[in-house]
């Protein structure tokens, strides 16, 4: 069942079939005998009751006022009345753009991120039984799609998919051909969910150590799910049996990003571990960022300004 017309202000394009459905429809069926009336008021005219005799273009059904089609002079306020229930709509009928397959003011805009799922389905549940065929146009050029009852696009979005997509339903009513157009303005944008990964803390860290002791160098970053964080040290990683990369820890942030931490553990610190760079790198599709750690003997601390130390 088609949902009722709850929007109080409605804009439609001249020359298309259109309907208003009141929102107490289920109630109306229960009270079959209740008097139900539709009214229109516009400008000077106060509440004029509508019936099929008032216009050959108007049809009344249980819950619905239909226009075959709606025209510019249908602009105005419409009321449905039943007992103590009243519903009001303000209808604005606008001119059709004769130079295009759609009217700019009647366009629904959608933003789709590149590589994300993108779908357009041409459906019209209210007029479904009357529709002969449906065509889908992109920038007013007809797309050749297999299903001509409900043409559909389902794909991962590419920048080339940007444009105006118009679903045009063709239907017959009382021997006349009508069409209903629904247009979407699709804008394809960059993946907005990605952040530039951030390595936390200073870019250069001098760590005071004692020979023979152990040290844990902690590298933390805020990053995207697919980003990687790793340690680089020496000519060939893993050549020093005293150096161990611990398992990465990841915690999801409330914004859906990741806080990652990776520890480099250096055991039994020797002279060869001093004054060399231990680099922690975060890599993403945007590139890389690196922070460095240098182990310094505690005795040599006095030579370096205090603010560069981490513990």
């Amino acid at each position: 069942a088609e949902s009722c017309t709850s929007r109080p202000h409605i804009t439609v394009v001249e020359g298309e079939p259109f309907y208003l459905k009141h929102c107490s429809c289920s109630l109306a069926h229960e009270i079959e005998t209740t008097t139900k009336s539709w009214y229109k008021s516009s400008g000077s005219q106060e509440h004029v009751e509508l019936n099929p005799r008032s216009s050959s273009r108007i049809a009344l059904h249980d819950c619905v006022l239909e226009f075959w089609p709606v025209e510019l002079n249908d602009t105005g306020s419409y009321f449905f009345q039943m007992k103590n229930y009243t519903q009001k709509w303000k209808l604005n009928v606008i001119r059709r753009n004769k130079h295009s397959c759609f009217t700019e003011r009647q366009v629904t805009s959608k933003i789709v991120e590149v590589k994300k799922f993108f779908q357009i389905t041409c459906e019209n549940s209210y007029y479904q039984t009357l529709v002969n065929s449906t065509s889908l146009y992109k920038n007013c050029k007809k797309l050749l799609l297999e299903n001509n009852k409900n043409p559909t696009i389902k794909k991962n979005a590419e920048f080339e998919d940007q444009g105006y997509y118009s679903c045009v339903h063709f239907l017959h009513h009382n021997g006349k051909l009508f069409n209903i157009t629904k247009t979407f303005n699709i804008t394809i944008v960059e993946d907005r969910s990605n952040i530039v990964p951030v390595l936390l803390g200073p870019k250069l860290n001098h760590v005071a150590v004692e020979l023979g002791k152990n040290v844990r160098l902690n590298c933390s970053a805020l990053l995207n799910e697919e980003d990687v964080i790793y340690w680089m040290f020496g000519e060939e990683n893993g050549s020093d049996p005293n150096i161990h990369e611990e398992k990465e820890m990841r915690i999801m942030t409330p914004e859906g990003k990741w806080h990652a931490s990776k520890v480099l553990r250096i055991e039994n610190i020797g002279e060869s571990n001093l004054n060399v760079l231990y680099n922690c790198t975060v890599a993403s599709t945007g590139g890389t960022d690196t922070k460095s750690f240098i182990l310094v003997r505690k005795a040599d601390m006095a030579d370096i300004p205090g603010h560069v130390f981490t513990r």
């Epitope: 960059e190 590139g287 890389t288």
Partner: antibody, heavy 115, light 113 residues
């Protein structure tokens, strides 16, 4: 339109330098790193290095270290690759490509090194 | 450096038949923190730049026909073309983007038998 537009073909003498440009359009330039990949005639693809567009960090292939410099100009969304001390075996088509899996490529710039 | 080795170097397959190209990395390109394999496949036709087919080892790039599929994890990967078409004649490359330098396989030339 999303594209990478590269500068035109170059003919250089051994020992000279070449600078190839790659202008990005249709996307946010600093969202993706730019890699440079070269292909010698009839050969496979060789990754030369890449530059991080948001901070200027570079990673170069070991064999080109010292001869190659990659830079960017974010104001014009353009990446540059300069190769110095050219040799005949540097004759190749040089491509710029976007991201870490390369979903967008330039058309390529043929650099011929010949005396 | 991570060395990528493709097999075979060249392959001839009949139209409509299945084509399979393998790629082996000298160390794992699987990242346990996010369960992703940092491997891509490209197609290159003469006189053109390479064209991305597959990334994350098995995700098909949009616009790529569904006859192309990628599989594998860790160090062993496969590109499969389920039903070879004439326009699939090209050289195919795998590439790891797990660690710099981001290395390519040597390429596999695919021809029609």
């Amino acid at each position: 339109q999303v594209q990478l537009v590269q500068s035109g073909a170059e003919v250089k003498k051994p020992g000279a330098s070449v600078k190839v440009s790659c202008k990005a359009s249709g996307y946010n330039f600093i969202s993706y790193g730019i890699s440079w990949v070269r292909q010698a005639p009839g050969q496979g693809l060789e990754w030369m290095g890449w530059i991080t567009t948001y901070n200027g960090n570079t990673n170069y292939a070991q064999k080109l270290q010292g001869r190659v410099t990659m830079t960017t100009d974010t104001s014009t969304s353009t990446a540059y690759m300069e190769l110095r001390s050219l040799r005949s075996d540097d004759t190749a088509v040089y491509y710029c490509a976007r991201g870490w899996y390369f979903d967008l490529w330039g058309r390529g710039t043929l650099v011929t090194v010949s005396s | 450096d991570i060395v990528m080795t493709q097999s075979p170097d060249s392959l001839a397959v009949s139209l409509g038949e299945r084509a399979t190209i393998n790629c082996k990395s000298s160390q794992s390109v699987f990242y346990s923190s996010n369960n992703k394999n940092y491997l891509a496949w490209y197609q290159q036709k003469p006189g053109q730049p390479p064209n991305l087919l597959i990334y994350w080892a098995s995700t098909r790039e949009s616009g790529v026909p569904d006859r192309f599929s990628g599989s594998g994890s860790g160090t062993d990967f496969t590109l499969t073309i389920s039903s070879l078409q004439a326009e699939d004649v090209a050289v195919y490359y795998c590439q790891q983007y797990y660690r710099t330098p981001y290395t390519f396989g040597q390429g596999t030339k695919l021809e029609i038998k």
